[in-house]
Interface confidence: low
């Protein structure tokens, strides 16, 4: 592989690494969305919530003169409850909505697939760099692109999940905004998907320059 190509691959791998860090951050944190009630009756406190793929946290926040609840960064009594994805017999204390649970299970499962693809891609990259097997960069690039797509699907499932929660008559929350974990997931998708495509492009053998050349005649990769 030529020096310029190697440099391009390294830059792409750095972008992919940033994508991996962002994807990991998004998966393990629970600030995908912040939900707040619109209190029609004057209360001294209100209950806002933020949630991720694995749990929902509610926080009792002091109310101001307006009817808005928050921001969630205000100090308050916090109570977190895990979505019990893997023990269907039990329902979560806070989350008793079956449709919502299905959404969070889907998003979490797809995120796990994404992490699986990231691991496979990283193994391919490590083997490629260690043993100079440049051809392994091609499957690695595909794995990263697939990981990015899985993150995108997770993001969309979470968007639907938030919409269902807000529209449901069985939650107190009416207003919402997407938070930093969601932004991390979106950025991870862009970096992994585009990085994967770029890596695929840079790791492919050089196309023949002349009509009489075949791919086999092209200069070797190393």
């Amino acid at each position: 592989m030529s020096q310029t190509k190697m440099l391009k691959v390294r830059v792409t791998l750095f972008c992919i690494l940033a994508g991996i860090v962002l994807a990991m951050t998004a998966v393990v944190t629970d600030h995908w969305a912040v939900l707040s009630p619109h209190m029609e009756h004057h209360n001294t406190t209100c209950e806002a919530a933020h949630f991720g793929l694995w749990r929902i946290c509610t926080k009792r926040i002091p109310m101001d003169d307006s009817k808005t609840c928050g921001p969630i960064t205000l100090p308050g009594e916090k109570n977190c409850s895990y979505f019990r994805h893997f023990n269907p017999g039990e329902s979560s204390e806070i989350f008793e909505f079956t449709t919502q649970k299905e959404y969070s299970i889907s998003a979490a499962a797809i995120a796990i697939f994404s992490l699986g693809f990231i691991i496979l891609g990283s193994l391919c990259v490590l083997l490629s760099l260690g043993k100079k097997r440049d051809y392994l960069l091609r499957p690695a690039s595909m794995f990263y692109a697939f990981a990015g797509l899985c993150i995108l699907v997770s993001v969309e499932v979470m968007r639907q999940s938030v919409k269902r929660m807000i529209d449901s008559e069985d939650t107190v929350w009416i207003e919402y905004y997407y938070s930093w974990s969601f932004a991390c997931a979106c950025a991870a998708f862009i970096l992994l998907f585009l990085g994967g495509l770029a890596l695929l492009l840079f790791s492919l053998p050089r196309m023949p320059r002349n009509p009489w050349e075949s791919c086999m005649d092209a200069e070797p990769e190393h």
Epitope: E40, N43, R60
Partner: antibody
């Protein structure tokens, strides 16, 4: 199926008392605000009272404050309206309505999505 | 005396569009969600619109609502004979700490 069934209406004398009940079924009663609304003959709807899911917060219309008491027994899935010092103007059909979802810090809204069939209260000498 | 004012009556021929207004103040419509109820003669009221413009499942999309400042309106398009009813707007009122209904509008299909 979500259902509300009122009872306890009837004839009462001015200054007398009546206790209305509203039996709920088909939903998690303790998670919802409940309300009483009345309609005098040939007149429009008038909100009477509301109570939060836990029963801890109650609201009353100015016309009934101090005379009517709203309460609920979540174990029996029943809403009550104790009416004392009844007046002729309290004559109406009384409806109970299922309100918005309640969390520990407040209720979502008081739009009534399910109504009972109503019970008639007549206050006359 | 209701704090939400509605016209006493509205009418239209089948297929026509009818609009009902509801006027209030900052303490009710201006600062809270608005609801619309339909009461067909001899029946119990039914929630038609919640949270300003949302329709509960089962309510046809011929019914639509909007809110602007301290007033609101309910529109019925493609009027049918089955739409003959009394329509009430309602909202929470902060100053009264209570729920207030509009005066009601009787819709007649000619």
């Amino acid at each position: 199926e979500v259902q509300l069934l009122e009872s306890g209406g009837g004839l009462a004398q001015p200054g007398g008392s009546l206790r209305l009940s509203c039996a709920a079924s088909g939903f998690t009663f303790s998670s919802y605000a409940m309300s009483w609304v009345r309609q005098a003959p040939g007149k429009g709807l008038e909100w009477v009272s509301s109570v939060s899911g836990s029963g801890g917060t109650t609201y009353y219309a100015a016309s009934v404050k101090g005379r009517f008491t709203v309460s609920r027994d979540n174990s029996k899935k029943t809403l009550y309206l104790q009416m004392n010092s009844l007046r002729a103007e309290d004559t109406a059909v009384y409806y109970c309505g299922k309100g918005g979802y309640c969390s520990s810090s407040g209720c979502r809204h008081y739009g009534m999505d399910v109504w009972g069939q109503g019970t008639t209260v007549t206050v006359s000498a | 005396q209701s704090v939400l004012t509605q016209p006493p009556s509205a009418s239209g021929t089948p297929g026509q569009r009818v609009a009902i207004s509801c006027s209030g103040s900052n303490s009710n419509i201006g600062n809270n969600y608005l609801y619309w109820y339909q009461q067909i003669p001899g029946t119990t009221p039914k929630l038609l619109i919640y949270r300003n413009n949302q329709r509960p499942s089962g309510v046809p999309d011929r019914f639509s609502a909007s809110k602007s400042g301290t007033s609101a309106s309910l529109a019925i398009s493609g009027l049918r004979s089955g739409d003959e009813a009394d329509y009430y707007c309602a909202a929470w009122d902060d100053s009264l700490s209570g729920y207030v209904f509009g005066t009601g509008t009787k819709v007649t299909v000619l």
